[in-house]
């Protein structure tokens, strides 16, 4: 397993919809062909898996059916979308990349980014 | 160096407005936020509201909504914050900071002297 | 919205003796993301310590953070000359961010 630089911006604020996008660029020394994405969060000292998706260079990335995941890459960047995010899911987001094929194995892990989340105030209530 | 500058003091008359700027240099500008904080004489510190360098997103203090505004402008690396309908209370020092995510506000700038009298 | 408590509103204290600060928020701080920052008279807030208990860069190593939840301290183990100012603690776990109203530090 060989060590990979991982860039990722610090801090980003989600929209008002609970959008939250970021691009995620790694460093890669050779041809990588199929390539690993997984995003993680951390919070509260604990690391839970948000996603995660395999591409071949070139294709789109492709999360499960279920994921509030979306992305697109485009040379060594990859551009991750995270939807329906709330307040209580304000935390530091970390992408991790993988190369998987062909040999060697290249692992890297950015320093994250912390996405803030903030719940839209309710609409007063309108009487008709 | 890391470091915030912003602009020169000001003096308003009730009812005016001011844009306070802020410009960074030493780091990626769109990799961080930055939060504005002001503190009128002799009191403590009041957070404004932040924005978002990386995609232009804001969040604003409940009591400021609607009469300030933050923006950014990535190609010269400034934040600005503009509060309008000045009142007397708005008199204080305006200062922006870099929001890192776990490392708090780390750099800070030196400070707008905002003063408002007719 | 996270309200911060701080206490005592001020501290007299001499130099060579040591200052407890204390920070209490409302509700539990995500990821324990509490600051405490120092700020001088016509001067900006300085950062010393964020994650409640790291010192920021520079720091020296007589200020130190802990606390966790809703109870968080500063302690300065001597105080130096210098070191009398107003202190805040911030919490920056969700947004919007919130300062507490600050502690002096004065020479008794």
């Known amino acids: 397993c060989k060590a990979m630089h991982v860039a990722q911006p610090a801090v980003v604020l989600a929209s008002s919809r609970g959008i939250a996008s970021f691009v995620c660029e790694y460093a890669s020394p050779g041809k990588a062909t199929e390539v690993r994405v997984t995003v993680l969060r951390q919070a509260d000292s604990q690391v839970t898996e948000v996603c995660a998706a395999t591409y071949m260079m070139g294709n789109e990335l492709t999360f499960l059916d279920d994921s509030i995941c979306t992305g697109t890459s485009s040379g060594n960047q990859v551009n991750l979308t995270i939807q329906g995010l709330r307040a209580m899911d304000t935390g530091l987001y970390i992408c991790k990349v993988e190369l998987m094929y062909p040999p060697p194995y290249y692992l890297g892990i950015g320093n994250g980014t912390q996405i803030y989340v903030i719940d839209p105030e309710p609409c007063p209530d309108s009487d008709f | 160096q890391v470091q915030l500058v912003q602009s020169g003091a000001e003096v308003k008359k009730p009812g005016a407005s001011v844009k306070v700027s802020c410009k960074a240099s030493g780091y990626t500008f769109t990799s961080y936020g930055i939060s504005w904080v002001r503190q009128a004489p002799g009191q403590g510190l009041e957070w404004m509201g932040w924005i978002s360098a990386y995609n232009g997103n804001t969040n604003y203090a409940q009591k400021l909504q609607g009469r300030v505004t933050m923006t950014t402008d990535t190609s010269t690396s400034t934040a600005y914050m503009e509060l309008r309908s000045l009142r007397s209370d708005d008199t204080a020092v305006y200062y922006c900071?870099?929001?890192?995510?776990?490392?708090?506000?780390?750099?800070w700038g030196q400070g707008t002297k905002v003063t408002v009298s007719s | 919205e996270i309200v911060l408590t701080q206490s005592p509103g001020t501290l007299s204290l001499s130099p060579g003796e040591r200052a407890t600060l204390s920070c209490r928020a409302s509700q539990s701080v995500s990821s324990n993301y509490l600051a405490w920052y120092q700020q001088k008279p016509g001067q900006a807030p300085r950062l010393l310590i964020y994650?409640?208990?790291s010192r920021a860069t520079g720091i020296p190593d007589r200020f130190s953070g802990s606390g966790s939840g809703t109870d968080f301290t500063l302690t300065i183990s001597r105080l130096e000359p210098e070191d009398f100012a107003v202190y805040y603690c911030?919490?920056?776990?969700?947004?919007?961010?919130?300062f507490g109203p600050g502690t002096k530090v004065d020479i008794k």
């Open positions: 911030q919490q920056y776990g969700s947004s919007p961010f919130t």
């Open positions: 994650g409640a208990s």
């Open positions: 900071a870099r929001i890192t995510g776990p490392y708090a506000f780390d750099i």
